[in-house]
């Protein structure tokens, strides 16, 4: 990470094994204002690798509820509406930060998390390999 | 949220504002340990909707680098190489949670902040709006 | 549990189209499966024809593309096969069976199949 | 189209004997999600096929553990280590990371 000086008015921690525990502020600050974020909600239907959307619910997790992507075929959708094998319908995939519980239950105490989730699917052109 | 039961085994929080001020240990936990992130690291170039990756550099963020999407083309890729604009390239956009230094420069003290993000481009079908 | 069941001509005359129903019982076919029909010809040689989604979407074998249609009616739970334009190299048993499309993509349960013969 | 090539085309065993089928296909089966759908029926005398073995290794509900997939790439083995005369019959090796087809059968038989 970056040496960042430290500033007089910043909190105090007595945490003994600072820097690894900070204090957050879970009042969040939402920076999409200007971003419409449902203008991209139907592009699960109609993409030409279309995906479901299934809710994964984890009470010990913040955000709780997290959707991940699962893609429809495993070939790619054509203009006339056929499955083309020819083509492969892919999960993008980006790791996240949530934050866990722990220790579990507790209200008040997290631990940050990377969990890997698929947000959408796309159409790519697969790697052919020949046999000899 | 989901109310969860104080539990005795649990770290005390003395902050006036609890449960909105929490305790968060940055000794990140990752899950992904049984998924290879490298497979889908060539879908951007094999996309029918490829895409371009932005570095996003902010050191008052946690974590301070982000790679945003920017599709290539207004159009999909067809087999044959060329862009078919009778279809769309879009950006899938997901909402993520990062760490906000705050006060500025603290090393201890952060909030949590949602960010739009774009993922990737997939290729979507048009929505056309005839002329009456 | 979930049954699919055949019906439809067991003759056909060459150049007519072979129209064949599956009839779903126990499962939706709105439900994350694709529902398939798959034939089967003298000698054991198993060929796949095509499919229909839960979303309705369908996939046919390139080398029937011309000549094949999956349809479905969710109000009765049936799926169908039309097939034009038949020729005796036509004649085979002919199953519809389900395919758990969500995750392991394979066919996972077979009708008892219905035999037909294309001739004059 | 994918060609499935099983060998071999019959396969005379002993009950309680070990047999070996072998598939291969004329392209790679794993699919750019890195999954590889390589499945095998069995399909006995006078009934439709039931599969056994799904993406390679896995067994199908109810499917006795003396049954065992393996392989990678394009080339897959089918195994049952002890043959019971419930296992007669024809067995077909399966793709659908592409357009599906089916391999041309082993059938197993007593000797």
């Known amino acids: 990470g970056i040496a960042i000086p430290r500033n007089s008015g910043c909190p105090n921690s007595e945490d003994k094994n600072f820097p690894r525990t900070v204090m957050v502020n879970l009042n969040i600050h939402n920076r999409n204002t200007s971003t419409n974020p449902k203008r991209s909600s139907d592009y699960y239907n109609r993409s030409t690798s279309p995906w479901n959307l299934h809710r994964n619910e984890d009470p010990e997790r913040y955000p709780s509820v997290i959707w991940e992507a699962k893609c429809r075929h495993l070939g790619c959708v054509k203009a006339d509406g056929n499955v083309d094998y020819h083509m492969n319908s892919v999960p993008i995939q980006q790791e996240i930060l949530v934050l866990r519980r722990e220790p579990r239950h507790c209200p008040n105490s997290f631990r940050l998390e990377k969990i890997l989730v698929s947000v959408g699917c796309t159409c790519v052109t697969p790697i052919v390999h020949h046999v000899a | 949220g989901i109310a969860i039961p104080r539990n005795s085994g649990c770290p005390n929080s003395e902050d006036k504002n609890f449960p909105r001020t929490v305790m968060v240990n940055l000794n990140i936990h990752n899950r992904n340990t049984s998924t290879n992130p490298k497979r889908s690291s060539d879908y951007y170039n094999r996309s029918t909707s490829p895409w371009n990756l932005h570095r996003n550099e902010d050191p008052e963020r946690y974590p301070s680098v982000i790679w945003e999407a920017k599709c290539r083309h207004l159009g999909c890729v067809k087999a044959d190489g060329n862009v078919d604009y009778h279809m769309n390239s879009v950006p899938i956009q997901q909402e993520i949670l990062v760490l906000r230094r705050e006060p500025r420069h603290c090393p201890n003290s952060f909030r949590l902040e949602k960010i739009l993000v774009s993922v990737g481009c997939t290729c979507v079908t048009p929505i056309v709006h005839h002329v009456a | 549990d979930v049954q699919v069941q055949e019906s439809g001509p067991g003759l056909v005359k060459p150049s007519q189209s072979l129209s064949l129903t599956c009839t779903v019982t126990?499962?939706?076919?709105?439900?994350?499966?694709?529902w398939n029909w798959i034939r089967q010809f003298p000698g054991n040689k198993l060929e796949w024809m095509g499919y229909?989604?839960?979303?309705?979407?369908?996939s046919y074998n390139p080398s029937l593309k011309s000549r094949i249609s999956i349809t479905r009616d969710t109000s009765k739970n049936q799926f169908f096969l039309q097939l034009n334009s038949v020729t005796t190299e036509d004649t085979a048993t002919y199953y519809c069976?389900?395919?758990?499309?969500?995750?392991?993509?394979?066919?996972?349960?077979w009708g008892q199949g219905t035999s037909v013969t294309v001739s004059s | 189209i994918i060609v499935m090539t099983q060998t071999p085309l019959s396969l005379p065993v002993s009950l309680g004997d070990q047999a070996s089928i072998s598939c291969r296909s004329s392209?790679?089966?794993?699919?750019?999600?890195?999954?590889?759908?390589l499945h095998w029926y069995l399909q006995k005398p006078g009934q439709s096929p039931k599969l056994l073995i799904y993406?390679?290794?896995n067994r199908f509900s109810g499917v006795p553990d003396r049954f065992s997939g393996s392989g990678s790439g394009t080339d897959f083995t089918l195994k049952i280590s002890r043959v019971e005369a419930e296992d007669l019959g024809v067995y077909f090796c399966?793709?659908?990371?592409?357009?599906?087809?089916f391999g041309g059968g082993t059938k197993l038989e007593i000797k």
């Open positions: 069976a389900r395919e758990e499309y969500d995750d392991i993509y394979a066919v996972d349960y």
């Open positions: 126990g499962n939706s076919i709105t439900s994350y499966y694709a």
């Open positions: 229909i989604t839960y979303s309705g979407t369908t």
């Open positions: 392209q790679s089966l794993v699919h750019s999600n890195g999954n590889t759908y």
């Open positions: 993406k390679v290794y």
């Open positions: 399966s793709q659908s990371t592409h357009f599906p087809t």
